[in-house]
C-alpha cells in the first residue's frame, strides 16, 4: 500500500508539473481535474502545488493562480465568474476523453474561493478504505 | 489603483487587547487575501496570518491562540485583534494585499504596549 | 515550522558591482518563496515571488534562482538606491515565514 501511495504522489506531481503542456494529452490532467472537483481539494500537498506551472501563472503580483477545478463553487455567490468561466469549464470533467488547447486552461486566483486542501490526504483516505 | 491603509491606537496597556483596521481600495476582498505582518523596533518582520477572498484564515502558530482576522467586504475593511497583549507585542503592524506573497503594504501603525 | 536562514546578515558593496544574498529552508518549500526590499522608515516591497517571477515595476537587475531548499536574490549592477535590507519569505504549507534579513550598504 506505501508502495502504491508514492507511485500515485509520483504519477500527480507529474501530471501537475506537466500541465498544460500537451494539448493532444490531457487525459491525466482531466482526470485530475475531476478528482480535484470531486474530492473538493487542490493540489497534492496544498494548493501551492500549482504555483510553478507557468501556464496558469499570472503576471507579476497576480502571479498565484489554480486551475478552475480547485474553485469551491460552494463558497461563492459571484455569479458572474460562475457563469462564465467557471461551470462552461467543470461542464468538461465529465467527457474527460477530450481533447483541450491550451487556450482552454481555465485558471482561477488561488487567493479567492477554492479548496485549501491538498488532495493526498483524502486520496489516501480512500485508498486505505478500498 | 491599489491602497492599503491601517489605523490603530498607539499605545495599549498590557494584558488589554489590541484592534487595528486596515483599509483597503482598488481591489477585491473577495478575490485578495489580506495578510497581517509586524516588525518589533530595530527587529526582522513577522508574518501574522492572512484572511482569504473566502473568509477562511491561516494563524502563525504561536500567536493562534491570541490572534483572530476578520473582515467586513460592504466596508472594505480587515480587522486585527489580538489579546492578552505583553512588551513582546511592541512593534509596527501592516497589512498587505496577498496571501502568499504581499504585493501592496500599508505604511504601518506603530503600537506600543506600555502601561 | 519551517526555518527560513539568511546570509551574509550584512555586506557593503559598492556601486555597479554584483551582489548575492541566499536563502535556505529547513524542508523544501517548492519555489513557494518572496523577496522584498525595505528601507529605513518605510514598508517593505515586493521584488520577487514564486522564486524567479519579478514583480511588476522591478528592474530586470533584479533576479531570483533557486529550487527545494536554496534559494538566491541577484543584483546584477547595484545601483545607489538599492541599499536597505532584503527578507525572503516562504509560503508553503499553511503557515508562512521570513528570513532574518540582509542589510545592503553601499561602500
Known amino acids: 500500500r506505501a508502495q502504491l501511495e508514492r507511485s500515485l504522489r509520483d504519477v500527480v506531481e507529474k501530471t501537475i508539473q506537466k500541465y498544460g503542456t500537451n494539448p493532444e494529452e490531457t487525459a491525466a490532467e482531466e482526470s485530475w481535474d475531476y478528482v480535484q472537483f470531486q474530492l473538493r481539494c487542490c493540489g497534492w500537498h496544498y494548493p501551492q502545488d500549482w504555483f510553478q506551472v507557468l501556464i496558469l501563472r499570472g503576471n507579476g503580483s497576480e502571479a498565484h493562480r489554480v486551475p478552475c477545478s480547485c474553485y469551491n463553487l460552494s463558497a461563492t455567490n459571484d455569479s458572474t465568474i460562475l457563469d462564465k468561466v467557471i461551470l462552461p469549464q467543470l461542464s468538461r470533467l465529465g467527457h474527460l476523453a477530450r481533447s483541450r488547447h491550451s487556450a482552454d486552461i481555465c485558471a482561477v486566483p488561488a487567493e479567492s474561493h477554492i479548496y485549501r486542501e491538498g488532495c493526498a490526504q483524502g486520496l489516501q483516505k480512500w485508498l486505505h478504505n478500498n | 489603483q491599489v491602497q492599503v491603509q491601517e489605523s490603530g491606537p498607539g499605545l495599549v496597556a498590557p494584558s488589554q487587547t489590541l484592534s487595528i483596521t486596515c483599509t483597503v481600495s482598488?481591489?477585491?476582498?473577495?478575490?485578495?487575501?489580506v495578510s497581517w505582518v509586524r516588525q518589533p523596533p530595530g527587529k526582522g518582520l513577522e508574518w501574522l496570518g492572512v484572511i482569504w477572498g473566502d473568509g477562511s484564515t491561516n494563524y502563525h502558530p504561536s500567536l493562534k491562540s491570541r490572534l483572530s482576522i476578520k473582515k467586513d467586504h460592504s466596508k472594505s475593511q480587515v480587522f486585527l485583534k489580538l489579546n492578552s497583549l505583553t512588551a513582546a507585542d511592541t512593534a509596527t503592524y501592516y497589512c498587505?494585499?496577498?496571501?502568499?506573497?504581499?504585493?501592496?503594504w500599508g505604511q504601518g501603525t506603530l503600537v506600543t504596549v506600555s502601561s | 515550522d519551517i526555518q527560513m536562514t539568511q546570509s551574509p546578515s550584512s555586506l557593503s558593496v559598492s556601486v555597479g558591482e554584483r551582489v548575492t544574498i541566499t536563502c535556505r529552508a529547513s524542508e523544501n518549500i517548492r519555489s513557494n518563496l518572496a523577496w522584498y526590499q525595505q528601507k529605513p522608515g518605510k514598508s517593505p516591497k515586493l521584488l520577487v515571488n514564486?522564486?524567479?517571477n519579478l514583480a511588476d515595476g522591478v528592474p530586470s537587475r533584479f533576479s531570483g534562482s533557486g529550487s527545494g531548499t536554496d534559494y538566491s536574490l541577484k543584483i546584477n549592477s547595484l545601483q545607489p538606491e538599492d541599499f536597505g535590507t532584503y527578507y525572503c519569505?516562504?509560503?508553503?504549507?499553511?503557515?508562512?515565514?521570513f528570513g532574518q534579513g540582509t542589510k545592503l550598504e553601499i561602500k
Open positions: 514564486v522564486a524567479t
Open positions: 498587505a494585499k496577498g496571501g502568499y506573497s504581499l504585493a501592496h
Open positions: 482598488g481591489f477585491s476582498l473577495t478575490t485578495s487575501g
Open positions: 519569505q516562504h509560503y508553503w504549507g499553511t503557515t508562512w515565514t
